[in-house]
Interface confidence: low
């Protein structure tokens, strides 16, 4: 037989706290134990679960745990079953709730001298005791004009008056604990002698010189006073109007009328109601003068056919907010279709060429109207008027390549030469019509040129080859003055190019023929052995059939090239002594001597007292100092050539003679004796 060693018993429990219903059984065979609540099996949850054969409650719940619990033990082999005694909880709880109006049915029905009943929706078990508060101050039962019914949880105000106005709250406590109202009730019972608002003035916006009306009404018993003030506290009455409110009228019903409104009338108007008791009520309204600013300019717009584009119209600042609409050709645009207005935007869907033109954005309010035009161009792909042609351009002259196209808007033209963009410079210029000008055609300008004409809608291009018609010219032009060394072999070259290979010949300027030792070999004048008679003026003539001939004049000078007769030597001089650097050159024409000291030419006119250059070319430096040390270069030059030679100058301290050395001992290095 199954025997219960411990049976569950009824007990007190606290809402939300732990509890345990015990159950222990003894049986000859294995049994399983389960629990019933009001006859239905209890399923385990995190809150309520079997603990061995007992039932454990992590947090008692007054709703889910009310009823009768029973422990059942069953032998699954024999089918024997035993049930414990019934057990239940006496759950103690308290739960907060709001303070609500019980009587009358709505706040709107609360009038002075009526009965008002408030209910405190705090509940619990055992039944709690209640305490009421007004504005945080406890109300005790039996005080004047109110009764507290703990049984019904009610507070009755009989009769209710302005002195009962305030914030009502309640608290309750029981053996379980304490709770206060979750939401409080504000009772507002107006004193009939207090001013109350019936009609409040509203802000108004009016155009200049129009009229404005403010309405204002208060009620009270006895009737309240009403006063209007302008923002600087100036009272407005029909008897005394401030200078800037001459056209103001206050009506018997409290309304204020302002006629022919000017900017100085704009501002805040205050309507003040004063009852027999209580504070004044101040109502405010602002009078705004309507205004509208100018609209910003639109940039012209270029769109492509077939695309969808939008143009936004920014409304001007204004009061009231200006309304905005778009027009085209004097007709207001619809709010749907292919070309339509959406909000402040002009929308052009699937643009056609016919959509081009002037569209106008309008903005208007009480203050007036503003408008702004936007010019819309529908771009087209360029078409050819004249393509660039393969051209022959003359060297040295300006050359032109056409690229004439038409489109909307005016197309932009760029040129390429050998696939490289031509940037305008001193040689290249692109005219407004697209034509390319090459200012001075050169041989290497003979190549491929390509022009591209574009608009936002697309581009076209074409190319042409330029052939340069080379002019007849010397390449290079012979030097007009040349020297030949006497008694030596000499050559004077002359070459030229042209559209056809030119023939080149030399002749003497006086027309006399060349001597036999002088030959003209394919333009090169060759002197086997130069004589004095070979000096003179010669002319190189280049000619071909189509271009005629050109001439270059050359003056040949026969010279004995420069040689040095005396060259300066490496020289060491004692400080304070005189240095002599000798230099003598010969040649024909007679060479001139110049000296360069320490990387600068020594100007004979600016040498100073210490330096002197002799007629024969030698350089003398008196009273030498260490800073005179360095390399000195002798430069000999005439109209035919220049030669130079250099030597170092060292300036040293004079040594002090030692005891062992006699007065005749030689110096340790070669010195100039002066």
């Amino acid at each position: 037989a199954i025997v219960f060693i411990k049976q569950p018993s009824s007990q007190d429990a606290l809402q939300g706290r732990r509890a345990l219903l015990r159950c222990e059984v003894e049986a000859p065979g294995p049994v399983h134990v389960y629990w019933l609540l009001d006859g239905a099996p209890v399923q385990d949850t995190e809150r309520r679960f079997a603990q061995g054969s007992s039932l454990s409650f992590a947090a008692v719940d007054r709703l889910q745990d009310s009823g009768t619990f029973q422990c059942v033990a069953r032998d699954d082999v024999t089918g024997e079953e035993a049930r414990s005694a019934n057990a239940s909880f006496n759950i103690k709880w308290i739960e907060a709730g709001p303070v609500v109006l019980k009587h009358p049915a709505s706040e709107a029905e609360i009038q002075p001298q009526t009965q008002v009943t408030l209910r405190c929706h705090i509940d619990g078990h055992p039944r709690p005791t209640y305490q009421w508060f007004r504005d945080g101050t406890p109300l005790s039962d039996g005080q004047s004009n109110h009764t507290v019914s703990s049984k019904e949880r009610n507070l009755t105000l009989r009769p209710a008056g302005p002195e009962h106005s305030g914030l009502y709250s309640c608290c309750a406590h029981s053996a379980f604990g304490q709770a206060c109202s979750s939401q409080n009730f504000t009772l507002s019972i107006a004193d009939e002698s207090f001013a109350r608002v019936v009609l409040a003035p509203q802000d108004v916006v009016v155009a200049r010189y129009e009229e404005a009306m403010f309405h204002c009404q208060f009620s009270a018993q006895p009737p309240p006073s009403l006063q209007w003030l302008f923002e600087d506290e100036t009272p407005i009455t029909n008897r005394s109007r401030p200078p800037h409110l001459r056209r103001a009228t206050v009506f018997a019903n409290g309304s204020l009328l302002l006629t022919q409104v000017r900017p100085r009338n704009a501002g805040i108007y205050r309507c003040i109601g004063q009852g027999q008791r209580g504070p004044p009520i101040i109502l405010e309204a602002t009078l705004h003068l309507a205004e509208i600013e100018d609209m910003p300019l639109f940039e012209p717009r270029v769109f492509t056919a077939g695309s969808e584009e939008r143009v936004t119209c920014l409304p001007p600042k204004g009061l009231p907010e200006p309304s905005v609409w778009w027009e085209h050709a004097g007709v207001r645009l619809p709010t749907h279709g292919r070309v339509y207005q959406k909000g402040h935007e002009l929308v052009l869907a699937n643009i056609a060429e016919s959509d081009a033109g002037v569209y106008t954005c309008h903005a208007a309010n009480l203050a007036g109207q503003r408008r702004q035009d936007v010019n819309i161009t529908v771009a087209t792909v360029p078409s050819w008027l004249k393509k660039p042609q393969d051209s022959q351009l003359e060297e040295g002259k300006p050359g032109y390549l056409d690229c004439l196209t038409q489109a909307t808007p005016k197309p932009t033209v760029v040129w390429y030469r050998n696939q490289m963009l031509i940037s305008e410079d001193s040689r290249f210029e692109v005219f407004k019509n697209g034509t390319l000008r090459i200012n001075s055609v050169e041989v290497y300008d003979g190549t491929w040129y390509r022009c591209m004409s574009s608009t936002p809608a697309g581009s076209i291009e074409a190319q042409a080859r330029v052939q340069v018609l080379e002019k007849l010219k010397f390449t290079p032009p012979p030097q007009p003055q040349q020297c030949m060394e006497f008694d030596k072999e000499a050559t004077v070259p002359c070459s030229a190019t042209g559209r056809e290979k030119p023939t080149i010949k030399w002749e003497r300027a006086d027309g006399s023929s060349l001597p036999e030792w002088v030959t003209d070999n394919a333009g090169t004048l060759h002197f086997a052995r130069v004589t004095r008679d070979d000096a003179g003026n010669y002319t190189c003539i280049a000619s071909n059939g189509p271009q005629g001939q050109i001439r270059a004049h050359v003056q040949l000078t026969v010279a004995v090239f420069i040689t040095f007769k005396v060259e300066p030597e490496r020289t060491t001089v004692y400080q304070g002594h005189t240095a002599l650097l000798q230099c003598e050159a010969q040649g024909d024409p007679k060479p001139l001597i110049q000296w360069k000291g320490k990387d600068r030419i020594l100007d004979p006119t600016k040498l100073g007292p210490r330096m002197h250059i002799f007629q024969n070319g030698s350089l003398v430096i008196h009273d030498v100092a260490p800073e005179d040390s360095g390399r000195y270069t002798c430069i000999a030059g005439n109209s035919c050539n220049i030669k130079h030679t250099e030597a170092p100058l060292y300036v040293v301290d004079k040594p002090v003679p030692e005891e062992s050395e006699g007065p005749g001992s030689p110096p340790p290095y070669k010195m100039i004796q002066t």
Partner: nanobody, 124 residues
């Protein structure tokens, strides 16, 4: 809800001084301009002085200039009005009023911007 409680009024002889205080609650005091207004017996309401939210701007009616000083302590949510050189014509109920967040000169008042007031009586 907005609550304003004036204090500091009383009976004073001509030439005397008083300091009125206004304790504010139920709104962000430091964000609003504040103002003193008064109502003499049998007369309309008139502005006395106003002060910006930060206390850096003040305005006075002509009769108050040089005699009255408005100030505020945002840490204590309190508005003050120092009344000096009082005259018999300064006798009135003095109210404190909540302005708006803008300039104190043109503060937009709510419908019932004032407390219950404090009575100042100047009499010999």
């Amino acid at each position: 809800q907005v609550q304003l409680q004036e204090s500091g009024g009383g009976l004073v002889q001509p030439g005397g001084s008083l300091t009125l205080a206004c304790a504010a609650s139920g709104f962000a005091f430091s964000s609003y301009a504040m103002r003193w207004v008064r109502q003499a017996p049998g007369k309309g309401l008139e502005g006395v002085s106003s002060i910006s939210a930060g206390g850096d701007e003040t305005y006075y009616a002509d009769f108050a200039k040089g005699r009255f000083t408005i100030s505020r302590d945002n840490a204590k949510n309190t508005l003050y009005l120092q009344l000096n050189s009082l005259k018999t014509e300064d006798t009135a109920m003095y109210y404190c009023a909540k302005g708006d967040r803008n300039s104190p000169r043109y503060s937009s008042w709510p419908i019932t911007p004032v407390g219950q007031g404090t009575q100042v009586t100047v009499s010999s």
